[in-house]
Amino acid sequence: MMTGTIETTGNISAEKGGSIILQCHLSSTTAQVTQVNWEQQDQLLAICNADLGWHISPSFKDRVAPGPGLGLTLQSLTVNDTGEYFCIYHTYPDGTYTGRIFLEVLESSVAEHGARFQIP
């Protein structure tokens, strides 16, 4: 039975050109994490394998950095990065757990409307 739960950073609103950290945390299970995949829509961004370490997809190498931890850092954000991001935890013996984060990247003119917020 899958007892674990995924906690995420929560949805994030960021400004064009900035950088953000996407993180997920698997709790309430003793299952062993064998691999974590980070995906955007249908694209694989990165893999963190327990034995082999990190692999960043070639098309994202310039703007995606591994970590901290099992998280992912996205740099030089563009409006095109707006969308849904998935952390997919492959575990043994539980199976797969998935977390979802919505990242919204705003032009500075739009972001200024929320100036009282911490905009990464």
Epitope: T8, T9, G10, N11, I12, S13, I20, I21, Q23, Q41, V79, N80, T82, G83, E84, R100, I101, F102, E104, L106, E107, S109, V110, A111, H113, G114, R116, F117, Q118, I119, P120
Partner: antibody
């Protein structure tokens, strides 16, 4: 002036599909996500999903995955929501709403009443 | 999904009253950057919902200062200091921090 103009009321048969439009004006269409909200029984509000007009990226409430499909036409600044395989449970008022996470849903369309009946 | 519990569901008022509506979430609405995406709406019959408050406590443009929002973490409040006829309707809170976005069940502000 920001405006979201939705298509008119629809009476559709069970099993059919239909598409609601939401024409945006008075702002940069690609600069804001477009959300869709369902209001049933005159009270409950449910978030269906959103679409980023800039790149077409979507995020759905899992409850509406397979029921609603969100698209945009950038050339006409129009967002669309297609509702599939309609049943009486889908009878409701549907709203489009312009929003950001920061400001919430600042502007709403006037709503489209969908009635599913044989 | 994050459950948003709104209380009370019904609130009978007289004009001039001060009222509070509560919104509680099943998990914290602060994201990892300390931002909390919590907004309040008024929905009047025959109209579209209108944004009152965003980011817990920021009044949207044109919203009278008798409306105020407060709270943090999982506990949020909308206060209306002096009820006027145009304030009657359904009030909703919405959390935008976690997917899917979720609304409270609504509070009906009606005359006693």
């Amino acid at each position: 002036e920001v405006q979201l103009q939705q298509s008119g009321p629809e009476l559709v048969k069970p099993g059919a599909s239909m598409k609601i439009s939401c024409k945006a004006s008075g702002f940069s269409f690609t600069g804001y996500t477009m959300n869709w909200v369902k209001q049933s029984h005159g009270k409950n509000l449910e978030w269906i999903g959103l679409i980023n007009p800039y790149n077409g990226a979507t995020s759905y409430n899992q409850k509406f995955k397979g029921k609603a499909t969100l698209t945009v036409d950038k050339s006409s600044s129009t967002a669309y929501m297609e509702l599939l395989s309609l049943t009486s449970e889908d009878s409701a008022v549907y709203y489009c709403a312009r929003g950001t996470l920061i400001t919430g849903f600042a502007y709403w369309g006037q709503g489209t009443l969908v009635t599913v009946s044989a | 999904d994050v459950v948003v519990t709104q209380t009370p569901l019904s609130l009978p008022v007289s004009f001039g009253d001060q009222v509070s509506i509560s919104c509680r979430s099943s998990q914290s609405l602060a994201n990892s950057y300390g931002n909390t995406y919590l907004s309040w709406y008024l929905h009047k019959p025959g109209q579209s919902p209108q944004l009152l408050i965003y980011g817990i406590s920021n009044r949207f443009s044109g919203v009278p200062d008798r409306f105020s929002g407060s709270g943090s973490g999982t506990d949020f409040t909308l206060k209306i200091s002096t009820i006027k006829p145009e304030d009657l309707g359904l009030y909703y809170c919405l959390q935008g921090t976690h997917l899917p976005l979720t609304f409270g069940a609504g509070t009906k502000l009606e005359l006693k």
